[in-house]
């Protein structure tokens, strides 16, 4: 089938005192091969500081997955979710605390 780019959505939630969890979700993409990871100051975080979900079918012939990491509150701006799919990439910052999501359909 043809390539379908993912919709990428970044959310944040309180984790523990002074920390937040940032989660990056990619959905609606085809084929299933995707790179999704967190970067700090432009550089990929090590694997052991990130948690990944499986790449799963979403019921529409496309796929979804997620990656999360825990960071210090106040450091959010240093982090971006990096997505790579079918030769294209995009970067997705963490929204500020008063706005909880960032939707971006990668073209």
């Amino acid at each position: 089938g043809s390539t379908v780019p993912p919709m990428v959505n970044v959310t944040r939630s309180e984790a523990s005192e002074g920390n937040i969890t940032v989660t990056c979700r990619a959905s609606g993409f085809y084929p299933w091969n995707i790179t999704l990871s967190w970067r700090q100051d432009g550089v990929s975080l090590s694997h052991d500081t990130q948690q990944w979900g499986d790449v799963l079918p979403d019921g529409n012939g496309t796929y979804q997955t997620w990656v999360a990491t825990r960071i210090c509150q106040g450091e959010e701006q240093r982090f971006t979710c990096y997505m790579e799919h079918s030769g294209n990439h995009s970067t997705h910052p963490v929204p500020s605390g008063n706005s909880h999501h960032h939707h971006h359909h990668h073209h």
Partner: antibody, heavy 117, light 107 residues
């Protein structure tokens, strides 16, 4: 010291193509995205696109998607911008820059591309 | 695309003056805004990122503020080397867009 050194000025005819290089030093080339920006004479700045030198994955401004090609050579730590089907309005200084998370921290010196018949 | 509107487009000031440049985004860009200084024939130089963080080596007379859609660059006491053109740039979403620039000239 982080440095981005670009190739020299080019003069091209309308309809031709140009390839501008950006050689990186002083950091791990494959760890950071390289961005491309242009500036027409006396005008503002315009983002063209970005490449991940490690994987070759790209992100283009829709305006340039049909004519711009971004590549990178890991063996020489060099990123390239090729712009095809040149027209007079492509006359500009073309800059490469390093993407440090959520801003551009280091820029090349710029390459003037002149399109004239 | 997010449009960035800078004002004024140019201004005349004297050494020692306090100068304020504003940048307005057409949508919420949180704090993902950078300010650059550019002199003729040179590449832009990063001054401020994340709306208010001073880049390394930039004098403390430069400061930035704002979030959401409205941002300000302030030069508290203009120095001879500050006469240049200043640009804002948003990093919330691609295409990354710049303001049209503000030229600071000698009165």
């Amino acid at each position: 010291e982080v440095q981005l050194v670009q190739s020299g000025a080019e003069v091209k005819k309308p309809g031709a193509s140009v390839k501008v290089s950006c050689k990186a030093s002083g950091y791990a080339f494959t760890n950071y995205l390289i961005e491309w920006v242009r500036q027409a004479p006396g005008q503002g700045l315009e983002w063209i696109g970005a490449i991940n030198p490690g994987s070759g994955a790209t992100n283009y401004n829709e305006k340039f998607k049909d004519r711009a090609t971004l590549t990178a050579d890991k063996s020489t730590n060099t990123a390239y911008l090729e712009l095809s089907s040149l027209r007079s309005e492509d006359t500009a200084v073309y800059f490469c820059a390093r993407f440090l998370g959520n801003y551009f921290d280091n820029w090349g010196q710029g390459t003037l591309v002149t399109v004239s018949s | 695309d997010i449009q960035m509107t800078q004002s004024p487009s140019s201004l005349s000031a004297s050494v020692g003056d306090r100068v304020t440049i504003t940048c307005r985004a057409s949508g919420n860009i949180h704090s993902y805004l950078a300010w650059y200084q550019q002199k003729p024939g040179k590449a832009p130089k990063l001054l401020i990122y994340y709306a208010e963080t001073l880049a390394d080596g930039v004098p403390s007379r430069f400061s930035g503020s704002g979030s959401g859609t409205d941002f300000t660059l302030t030069i508290s006491s203009l120095q001879p080397e500050d006469f240049a053109t200043y640009y804002c740039q948003q990093f919330w979403t691609t295409p990354y867009t710049f303001g049209q620039g503000t030229k600071v000239e000698i009165k």
